[in-house]
Interface confidence: low
Amino acid sequence: YYGCPSECTCSRASQVECTGAQIVAMPSPLPWNAMSLQILNTHITELPEDKFLNISALIALKMEKNELANIMPGAFRNLGSLRHLSLANNKLKNLPVRLFQDVNNLETLLLSNNQLVQIQPAQFSQFSNLKELQLYGNNLEYIPEGVFDHLVGLTKLNLGNNGFTHLSPRVFQHLGNLQVLRLYENRLSDIPMGTFDALGNLQELALQENQIGTLSPGLFHNNRNLQRLYLSNNHISHLPPGIFMQLPHLNKLTLFGNSLKELSPGVFGPMPNLRELWLYNNHITSLPDNAFSHLNQLQVLILSHNQLSYISPGAFNGLTNLRELSLHTNALQDLDGNVFRSLANLRNVSLQNNRLRQLPGSIFANVNGLMTIQLQNNNLENLPLGIFDHLGNLCELRLYDNPWRCDSNILPLHDWLILNRARLGTDTLPVCSSPASVRGQSLVIINVNFPGPSVQGPETPEVSSYPDTSSYPDSTSISSTTEITRSTDDDYTDLNTIEPIDDRNTWGMTDAQSG
């Protein structure tokens, strides 16, 4: 029986932990009955052959955040019971090809954040029990064919942040049990047809932060169990018809930060379980009818930071469960009165940072549960009578940074805002832009003695742009809704009100990026 090395702490449960920059060589002697050994944050640079000979009961070895640059080929000899090995966050450039030959019962092998430049084809040949292999954050420019062929039990493989430019289409062909494959933060520009065909149990595929320009039509056709697909921040300009046809279990799809110009009807579907679709930061200019009609469980649709100038009236058909719709920071000038009609469960809609000149009176007619509407920074001069009257749950309405025309036509909106001031938030209130006599004054607190209607040029909406109030039988004016006050700021979801630079962070990070 060995005692505990002076630079380590040992518990009765056979756990040994050695930490600290003062440790420059492998501590010894190690207790013969050690089952867990952690060597963390030391200055150890080398692992000799003889340090683990007498601790054959070891099950977990964690050597992380050291200066480890050199491991002798027989360093892990006699560790036949080892199940978990982490060498992450060291300075390893190469691994001896037979380094792992005696630890063939490993279940997890973590090699992330080293400086590995290559993996030998036979490096992992004896790991039939391996469940997780982490190679994130190395310098592997190429994965040789056959390197994973014996890892038949592997369920999680992370190859992110390495820098490969291409993949052999055969490299994953024996990984039928793989559930998570992370290839993000590389330089992949093209993924050959068939690369993922053997991965029938795959649940997560992370391909974000690459340079992928095109997707082969059948690339995901064998991945019927896929639940999360991350394709954001690539160079994808076109989605082939049918690309997502065989993904009935998909519940998250990220496509933001690409070069998509259009969405053909039916490209998304059928995906009955998709809950979130992230399409911001693309170059989409219009949305056709039925663009999302197969996504009847979709709850979040993010289309902000595109170049949308036209949305077909039936673009959102089928989205009966949508809760959040983000359309901000586009080039919208007009919206059809029926565009949101099928969105019966919509809670939050963001339309800020567009060029909207007017809104149809019926725009929110069927969206009775709306809680937040963001209309700031548009070209609105007035709003139709009764437009918000039926929205009993509305608790956040942002109207500032619009060129409000404060003549007598604004009175109904002014009166409604007085009664519903709490819904406007406390940050910025809407301000009159014209006529000159009231420019800069708050639309909410301005004196009600407005000037008469100004003479309007052809570019200005006529008063007739107000709908007939008979379309709302329960309301006689825009001010008929009783005031709603909020006791807390946590009652609602504040959707996408941050500046564009933050939008990427709020809507862009994925679980996959944590490795």
Partner: antibody, heavy 116, light 107 residues
Framework: QVQLQESGPGLVKPSETLSLTCTVS????????WSWIREASGKGLEWIGY???????NYNPSLKSRVSISVDTSKNQFSLRLKSVTAADTAVYYC??????????WGQGTLVTVSS | EIVLTQSPSSLSASVGDRVTITCRAS??????LAWYQQKPGKVPKLLIY???TLQSGVPSRFSGSGSGTDFTLTVSSLQPEDVATYYC?????????FGQGTKVEIK
């Protein structure tokens, strides 16, 4: 052992449709892709197109307007149809297993002559 | 489409000679290149894929090299049974394309 066998008429009249079937044995058609390739006399090898068991296809643009490839997974077969043939379509037609590019197993080939 | 140009079109060499065939792609195809051997009256046979990986059962005297646009097939010691036409094939992007072939004969 994986084997592929082409079958179909050896003589087709000009302007008619060439139809061939490839029967796969020793392997499931539900894995990999399945291609047709032809070799005209003195012309070398020309890839015609492939089919995936899901029905997905990809064709050589030079033939795309005339060709269709289909799959019958229940019979472990895939088929080629080439419309409006001319004498230039006379060739040995091979079916092959397409392992995402390289063709590792080929049929024996069948000579199709286009002649009236 | 990617055009593959083989050279030479034909060659004649003695048994035991080292023979080299080159294949040039019209644009970069990484290592997505295969080589085939077709003996007279026979079916093409896959020799090498991924530019340099020997297909199972192929004699070790065959080897491949190259990446990007320039590729080489080498027979280290030519044997009588190696008389055939050799084709390179691109599988980087569809349409898959073949070189025009190189005919190898024995002197």
């Amino acid at each position: 052992q994986v084997q592929l066998q082409e079958s179909g008429p050896g003589l087709v009249k000009p302007s008619e449709t060439l139809s061939l079937t490839c029967t796969v044995s020793g392997a499931s058609i539900n894995i990999y892709y399945w291609s047709w390739i032809r070799e005209a006399s003195g012309k070398g090898l020309e890839w015609i197109g492939y089919v995936h068991h899901s029905g997905g296809t990809n064709y050589n643009p030079s033939l795309k307007s005339r060709v269709s490839i289909s799959v019958d997974t229940s019979k472990n077969q895939f088929s080629l149809r080439l419309k409006s043939v001319t004498a230039a379509d006379t060739a040995v037609y091979y079916c092959a297993r397409d392992t995402y590019g390289p063709f590792d197993y080929w049929g024996q080939g069948t000579l199709v002559t286009v002649s009236s | 489409e990617i055009v593959l140009t083989q050279s030479p079109s034909s060659l004649s060499a003695s048994v035991g000679d080292r023979v080299t065939i080159t294949c040039r792609a019209s644009q970069g195809i990484s290592n997505y290149l295969a080589w085939y051997q077709q003996k007279p009256g026979k079916v093409p046979k896959l020799l090498i894929y991924a530019a340099s990986t020997l297909q199972s059962g192929v004699p070790s005297r065959f080897s491949g090299s190259g990446s990007g646009t320039d590729f080489t097939l080498t027979v280290s010691s030519l044997q009588p049974e190696d008389v055939a036409t050799y084709y390179c094939q691109n599988y980087y992007s569809a349409p898959w394309t073949f070189g025009q072939g190189t005919k190898v004969e024995i002197k």
